[in-house]
Interface confidence: medium
């Protein structure tokens, strides 16, 4: 099936009742598209990126927030944004690249020494359990004396990459995002042109380990461009 | 400590409607998807709905849609499903339950009886 | 949809004994499974997570196993606390769907 070729980086079309019927009329299901996965992505390059639209940061890629392009401009027009880099102005957690957080409006790096001093604005959990992940999607609560000494195992909630144990990633499935295996060589990988529009799909892959690129699996290249196949492959 | 508080079951007539809520403390309630679940008695579990923690995506099972509807109030922390047009078939304990059921509620009766 | 088989669907044990519950899906859901107690009259619990990973503040003598389509529930030494309903669930795809359960008695 297409999840054992997956690994766990589960991705699938919606079928109809989802992409469409599942979100009640009036619901922001086929409104709202969720993105595969990201757009900053450092293991991966996206062509023709195209801005896209998002109605909260879980529908962005781990790189990515979601918000209006211009300041003060229209909150109902929202996209996809690249996330801000250290010392860079923020307003929370999620506007930050993984690896910062969000303190005092400015984004700041969420290493294990600033973690037990500094963050006063994110409730550790994992999975809602006492472990150590960042819950859900936190944005602003308060910290127990519980410190930051593991991090998501598989298939724990988690905020961004950086919540989950070395070689997980942190993506979307359904309407939470979870820790989940990044890619190895060989594995189905997910290039995002960005054209058009997508249909709701809820389910993120990761992205390729170091040292891999997703691209174009060579017995595919004849293949017309909606079905090709990209894999992980060696640079 | 996480706790999901049930309520606006009863005794409601086939065709009729009802509203459940579900009062949510002991976590940030916006930063979870929640779902809601239930057992008619003496039977197993059924799935009836989700929702992201934004609001901005619902799902449902196949049996419910287009007759119940899910939403949220993050200012309130609390969780709503709308029944319309309710069923025999709709008896059960409706439990709210956070993330992927991480966590329940104690569950409230809904039963649908002439 | 995909169907979520438990079984044995009812077993009688002693407390002591290693008990072993399997479920078995339709389609490969890899590793997104969880297993849940349930007691008479309350919600159910979760036990583990991730087919594999133990819920916080569960004892350490339930684990799960599997990924897949084959998934298993061990109760290294059951105690008279585990006497329950235990489910199965799968939230590869939605619906999201659940065993039908497998009652866990004293012999």
């Known amino acids: 099936t297409l999840n054992s070729v997956l690994n766990s980086n589960a991705i699938k079309n919606l079928p109809p009742p989802l992409g469409g019927a599942a979100g009640h009329p009036g619901s922001a299901v086929s409104a709202a598209p969720g993105i595969l996965y990201p757009g900053g992505n450092k293991y991966q390059t996206i062509d023709n990126y195209q801005p896209y639209p998002c109605a909260e940061d879980e529908e962005c890629g781990t790189d990515e927030y979601c918000a209006s392009p211009t300041r003060g401009g229209d909150a109902g027009v929202q996209i996809c944004l690249a996330c801000r880099k250290r010392r860079k102005r923020c307003m929370r957690h999620a506007m930050c690249c993984p690896g910062n957080y969000c303190k005092n409006g400015i984004c700041v790096s969420s290493d294990q020494n600033n973690f037990r001093g500094e963050i006063e604005e994110t409730i550790t959990e994992s999975f809602g359990n006492d472990h150590s992940t960042l819950d859900g999607y936190s944005r602003r609560t308060t910290l127990s004396s519980k410190m930051y000494h593991s991090k998501g195992q598989e298939g724990s909630v988690c905020l961004r990459s950086s919540d989950c144990a070395t070689g997980l990633c942190c993506a979307r499935h359904f309407w939470s995002k979870i820790c989940k295996p990044v890619l190895k060589e060989g594995q189905v990988c997910t290039k995002h042109r960005r054209k058009g529009s997508h249909g709701l799909e809820i389910f993120q892959r990761c992205y390729c380990g170091e040292g891999l690129s997703c691209r174009i699996q060579k017995d595919h290249h004849q293949a017309s461009n909606s079905s090709r196949l990209h894999t992980c492959q060696r640079h | 400590q996480v706790q999901l508080v049930e309520s606006g079951g009863g005794l409601v007539q086939p065709g009729g409607s009802l509203r459940l809520s579900c009062a949510a403390s002991g976590f940030t309630f916006s930063s979870y998807g929640m779902s809601w679940v239930r057992q008619a008695p003496g039977k197993g579990l059924e799935w009836v709905s989700g929702?992201?923690?934004?609001?901005?995506?619902?799902y449902y099972a196949d049996s419910v849609k287009g007759r119940f509807t899910i939403s949220r109030d993050n200012s309130k922390n609390t969780l709503y499903l709308q029944m319309n047009s309710l069923r025999a078939e709709d008896t059960a304990v409706y439990y709210c339950?956070?993330?992927?059921?991480?966590?329940w509620g104690q569950g409230t009766l809904v039963t649908v009886s002439s | 949809d995909i169907q979520m088989t438990q079984s044995p669907s009812s077993l009688s044990a002693s407390v002591g004994d290693r008990v072993t519950i399997t479920c078995r899906a339709s389609q490969d859901i890899s590793n997104y499974l969880h297993w849940y107690q349930q007691k008479p009259g309350k919600a159910p619990k979760l036990l583990i997570y991730?087919?594999?990973n133990l819920q916080s503040g569960v004892p350490s003598r339930f684990s799960g196993s599997g990924s897949g389509t084959d998934f298993t529930l061990t109760i290294s030494s059951l105690q008279p606390e585990d006497f329950a309903v235990y489910y199965c669930?799968?939230?590869?795809?939605?619906?999201?769907?659940f065993g039908q359960g497998t009652k866990v008695e004293i012999k």
């Open positions: 339950a956070r993330h992927y059921m991480d966590h």
């Open positions: 669930q799968q939230y590869d795809s939605i619906p999201m769907t």
């Open positions: 929702i992201s923690g934004s609001g901005s995506y619902t």
């Open positions: 991730g087919a594999s």
